[in-house]
């Protein structure tokens, strides 16, 4: 039994880091493998992660981390029984994938303005809480070409757009994702999408 693709890990910088790897053949990850992880810090103790299958030869493990700070560094040991298959390390702050924003809501009752709001996925005491920026994706269910991205570079989790920038009388969907420049993170997953019917009053033409 050998590791074909070494584990790569990403952290949500709150409580979970996810490590994925591939073995050289079909593997029952949960029964055959264990990933041990330990914070490099005095008196820290090793924790065991039981991996799950992720495709025939792929494995994934969710490492629980109660608290993360930028200097944290973990040792990782991948075991098959008594055999050490791979040894490495992981610094969560250098491999951050933020949590996806939630509770995306479209408010359509504000005088021909669409107000999109969502929730910051981090609690206020987490470092990322004040460092997230967002991308909002809006698209038409009827017209695949009607697809747009709005970059929200301020901290407030909201976006206002004129309803007239979208077509009237048709349904749109929106979703939002987050990233943090400070840690050069990857983008989060998209939030679940929300749907609304776009309608607004055309301005009267003056003759």
């Amino acid at each position: 039994m050998k590791v074909l693709q070494e584990p790569t890990c990403v952290s949500d910088y709150m409580s979970i880091s996810t490590c994925e790897w591939k073995m050289n053949g079909p593997t029952n990850c949960s029964t055959e493998l264990r990933l041990l992880y330990q914070l490099v810090f005095l008196l820290s103790e090793a924790h065991t992660c039981i991996p799950e299958n992720n495709g025939g030869a792929g494995c994934v493990c969710h490492l629980l981390m109660d608290d993360v700070v930028s200097a944290d560094n973990y040792t990782l040991d991948l075991w098959a029984g008594q055999q050490l298959l791979w040894k490495g390390s992981f610094k969560p702050s250098e491999h951050v994938k933020p949590r996806a924003p939630g509770n995306l809501t479209v408010h359509t009752n504000v005088s021909d303005t669409l107000l999109l709001t969502w929730s910051n996925p981090y609690p206020p005491d987490n470092y990322l809480y004040n460092h997230l920026t967002y991308a909002v994706n809006i698209w038409s269910e009827n017209d695949p070409a009607d697809f747009r991205i709005y970059n929200v570079t301020y901290l407030e989790p909201s976006l206002r757009i004129a309803a007239s920038t979208l077509k009237s009388g048709i349904s749109y969907r929106a979703r939002v994702r987050a990233w943090a420049q400070c840690y050069n993170t990857t983008w989060s997953e998209w939030s679940p999408s929300t749907k609304w019917h776009n309608s607004y009053r055309e301005p009267f033409e003056q003759h």
Partner: antibody, heavy 116, light 107 residues
């Protein structure tokens, strides 16, 4: 909110015993090493003892080794310091601190006075 | 045991001044160093960890540098609330040890 609350301090005679407690809340207690630090009146900080999250490893300052015992009850989210053969120089405010990584959290301390 | 020597033991400064406190370890501790601020009657508050990382919520006027045996805490522009005692602490090995403290007083 993460909180540590020490109790058990008081006045004790030289040679006497005292047990300090530290009640933890707002975090997964068993995941963190914990520590006791003390500060004599008008003096600096002195580390006293530390214990791993499971309680399996303990360390002590030379000044208290053999007299003090650190322990924890993870089911009660509580850290303890049993202090025996107390001396006048043990008089101090005793702080408990969460020590599991760099994000140290301290309690407000409990005063131990050793005097006849 | 690793000895931590802090200097100066006290410093008089005015609001707006730049203040530098040094801490020397008796042997190499890599970056395993923390800096604390303590005000009378209060528990110590973590300012800097891992020698140079700013603890969340701590103002950016505080900064830490150094590695090995020599470390520095700098307050770039002293504010009224910064008058306090500052301690360094090594986290490289047991027993954990603190510096003797630096009291920052109003000039």
């Amino acid at each position: 909110e993460v909180q540590l609350l020490e109790s058990g301090g008081g006045l004790v005679q030289p040679g006497g015993s005292l047990r300090l407690s530290c009640a933890a809340s707002g975090f997964t207690f068993s995941s963190y090493a914990m520590s006791w630090v003390r500060q004599a009146p008008g003096k600096g900080l002195e580390w006293v003892s530390a214990i791993s999250g499971s309680g399996g490893s303990t360390y002590y300052a030379d000044s208290v080794k053999g007299r003090f015992t650190i322990s924890r009850d993870n089911s009660k989210n509580t850290l303890y310091l049993q202090m025996n053969s107390l001396r006048a120089e043990d008089t101090a405010i005793y702080y408990c601190a969460r020590y599991g990584n760099w994000n140290y959290i301290w309690g407000q301390g409990t005063l131990v006075t050793v005097s006849s | 045991d690793i000895q931590m020597t802090q200097s100066p033991s006290s410093v008089s400064a005015s609001v707006g001044d730049r203040v530098t406190i040094t801490c020397r370890a008796s042997q190499g501790i890599s970056s395993w160093l923390a800096w604390y601020q303590q005000k009378p009657g209060k528990a110590p508050k973590l300012l800097i960890y891992a020698a140079s990382s700013l603890q969340s919520g701590v103002p950016s006027r505080f900064s830490g540098s150094g590695s090995g045996t020599d470390f520095t805490l700098t307050i770039s522009s002293l504010q009224p609330e910064d008058f306090a005692t500052y301690y360094c602490q090594q986290a490289n090995s047991f027993p954990l040890t603190f510096g003797g403290g630096t009291k920052v007083e109003i000039k």
